[in-house]
């Protein structure tokens, strides 16, 4: 209905009032709902109101504003520190121990993120992003140096529809359109394959413990599993003579390790030289994540800390031990 | 077919020494942590000891620690656990099992296998 | 060290009935828990881990609930195969604890 200047919606009904026309909802059943658009972020609620913006928010702390889109410091609290003798003792012996997996206690000296004691060391967000891996969107923690929030701000995170038929024919030079999506993983590049390659600057290297052989067989799924966390392409590194850039890897012992090896002789069978895994040298080819997301790793430090954020949480289906990311062509090292 | 298949248990007298074995199959053994868990005759189940494999680092239940040594062999897929100065109270059938996520101590046991008797008795 | 309390640590059933069984830790461990079914004579078998997640290849007549301190298994529909010793585990910090067992038995 007309209200002079002021254009009512649908449903609502024209007041005047003492400070000018006013459109008003007298039955929110009939207007259109405030809170259809999802208004209010970081968690905060939204409840019907009868008077424009037909919506009002109530927001999670430390949030505040109409749509709850300010951040509100509390009180400086001194951060938090790993007290624990517990923690002090099993950091940095290969094995993640939940109860050292915290923020404070550097995950569990870098245990249980594979090597890397501070994945967000990059992240200048005034949140904690790192406790923010909460299956709803945080904007604050939605850049690459706050490792995009967990790729929590990408809506409805889609499943790939035919998952089992795209992950037997990824990367098979074969396209399958119906896999030619991101969270199929672009069918391993097969439809891409007449667009130019858009690598991120650096390299991935992970330590994996699998044997080359068995990594290599595998490779696909691998590249897959990996490429999925981080909503783009992998690929396995080729050397100057063209070779893919799989190591036999022989193992670091723990410190924890070192130490008992000096107090006691070495068991029969101990081989230094046994092949405890790989060491596989990837690179990020973006040529598809680049159309259809602005969620991608121009270099390879923060995918490199995504991969050790999924570990912390569990959600690695490789057995990943390390990853590094490195900036200039690796020498072939051990 | 992943299996675990313990031997080396047996009568012994208290302050003696046993080692028992755990032969693992069906899977990388090095990238999954091992426990010791035990069950004493009637009893219920008391976890004794933890090794993952890849990177040697080792945790013990209080009432073993300082008697009892857990190792592994990687180039022969088992695991040990060297008990001395054996008590009574270590009576119990020794189970080892396997931990479902590799380098994660903080995870179920997924895989178990058949248990060794171990009789401390004089 | 963190306690583990099992309650009941018997209980009488029929084939048929609901079964519930409670754990109850002695500080939190979010969902470090797990399940295990052990049978006289057995090894004991993983049912749940994670509080919650079923086991690959166990039936979908038991289920897991909890987190923080209190977790509860139930049996939907006890079945002869499931008389049976169940323990609950903590493996949020070492040492890992069980509970001390409930014994389902047949009324």
């Known amino acids: 209905s007309s209200c002079g200047q002021v254009k009512c919606r649908k449903g609502e009904q024209c007041v005047h009032t003492a400070s000018g026309p006013r459109c008003f909802c007298p039955s929110p059943r009939d207007c259109e709902s405030g809170c259809a658009s999802s208004p209010c972020q970081h968690g905060g609620s939204c409840h019907p109101q009868r008077q424009p913006p037909y919506y009002s928010c109530q927001c999670a702390p430390p949030f505040s504003g109409s749509r709850c889109e300010l951040y509100t410091a509390p009180p400086s609290t001194p951060p938090a520190t790993c007290l624990s003798q517990y923690c002090a003792d099993k950091a940095r012996d290969g094995v993640c121990d939940e109860a050292c997996n915290s923020h404070a206690c550097q995950w569990d000296g870098g245990d249980c993120s594979l090597t890397m004691e501070n994945p967000w060391a990059n992240c200048s967000s005034p949140l904690p992003c790192w406790d923010y891996i909460n299956n709803q969107c945080d904007e604050l923690c939605n850049t690459v140096e706050c490792l995009f929030d967990n790729f929590e701000c990408q809506g409805n995170s889609k499943t790939c529809k035919y998952d089992k038929y795209c992950a037997d024919h990824f990367k098979d030079n074969h396209c399958d359109q119906g896999c030619n999506s991101e969270e199929c993983g672009w069918d391993g590049l097969d439809c891409a394959a007449d667009q130019p390659e858009n690598l991120a600057e650096g390299t991935l290297v992970i330590v994996v413990l699998m044997p080359p052989e068995q990594l290599l067989q595998d490779a696909r799924s691998f590249l897959r599993a990996l490429g999925t966390l981080l909503h783009t392409n992998l690929r396995i590194k080729r050397d100057s003579q063209g070779e893919l850039m799989v190591y036999p890897y022989y193992g670091e012992k723990s410190a924890a390790m070192k130490k008992q090896r000096m107090t006691r002789r070495s068991l029969p069978g101990e081989q230094e030289q046994e092949v405890a895994g790989s060491k596989v040298f990837l690179e990020i080819d973006n040529r598809q994540c680049v159309q259809d997301s602005d969620h991608c790793f121009k270099n390879t430090d923060a995918a490199a800390a995504l991969l050790a954020s999924h570990a912390i949480q569990g959600t690695l289906s490789y057995p990943l031990v390390s990853v590094v990311s490195e900036s200039l062509t690796p020498e072939r090292t051990q | 077919e992943v299996q675990l298949v313990e031997s080396g248990g047996g009568l012994v007298q208290p302050g003696g020494s046993l080692r028992l074995s755990c032969a693992a199959s069906?899977?990388?053994?090095?990238?999954?942590?091992m426990s010791w868990v035990r069950q004493a005759p009637g009893k219920g189940l008391e976890w004794v000891s933890y090794?993952?494999?890849?990177?040697?680092?080792?945790y013990y239940a209080d009432s073993v620690k300082g008697r009892f040594t857990i190792s592994a062999d990687t180039s022969k897929n088992t695991a040990y656990l060297q008990m001395n100065s054996l008590r009574a109270e270590d009576t119990a059938v020794y189970y080892c099992?396997?931990?479902?996520?590799?380098?994660?101590?903080?995870?179920?046991?997924?895989?178990w296998g058949q248990g060794t008797l171990v009789t401390v008795s004089a | 060290d963190i306690q583990m309390t099992q309650s009941p640590s018997s209980l009488s059933a029929s084939v048929g009935d609901r079964v519930t069984i409670t754990c109850r830790a002695s500080q939190n461990i979010k969902r470090f828990l797990a399940w295990y079914q052990q049978k006289p004579g057995k090894a004991p078998k993983l049912l749940i881990y994670?509080?919650?997640t079923r086991e690959s290849g166990v039936p979908s007549r038991f289920s897991g609930s909890g987190s923080g301190t209190d977790f509860t298994l139930t049996i939907s529909s006890l079945q002869p195969e499931d008389f049976a010793t169940y323990y609950c585990q903590q493996y949020y910090r070492s040492p890992h604890t069980f509970g001390q067992g409930t014994k389902v038995e047949i009324k």
């Open positions: 090794i993952y494999p890849y990177s040697g680092a080792t």
């Open positions: 994670g509080a919650s």
């Open positions: 069906g899977y990388t053994f090095s990238s999954y942590g």
């Open positions: 099992a396997r931990h479902s996520g590799y380098y994660r101590i903080s995870s179920a046991m997924d895989v």
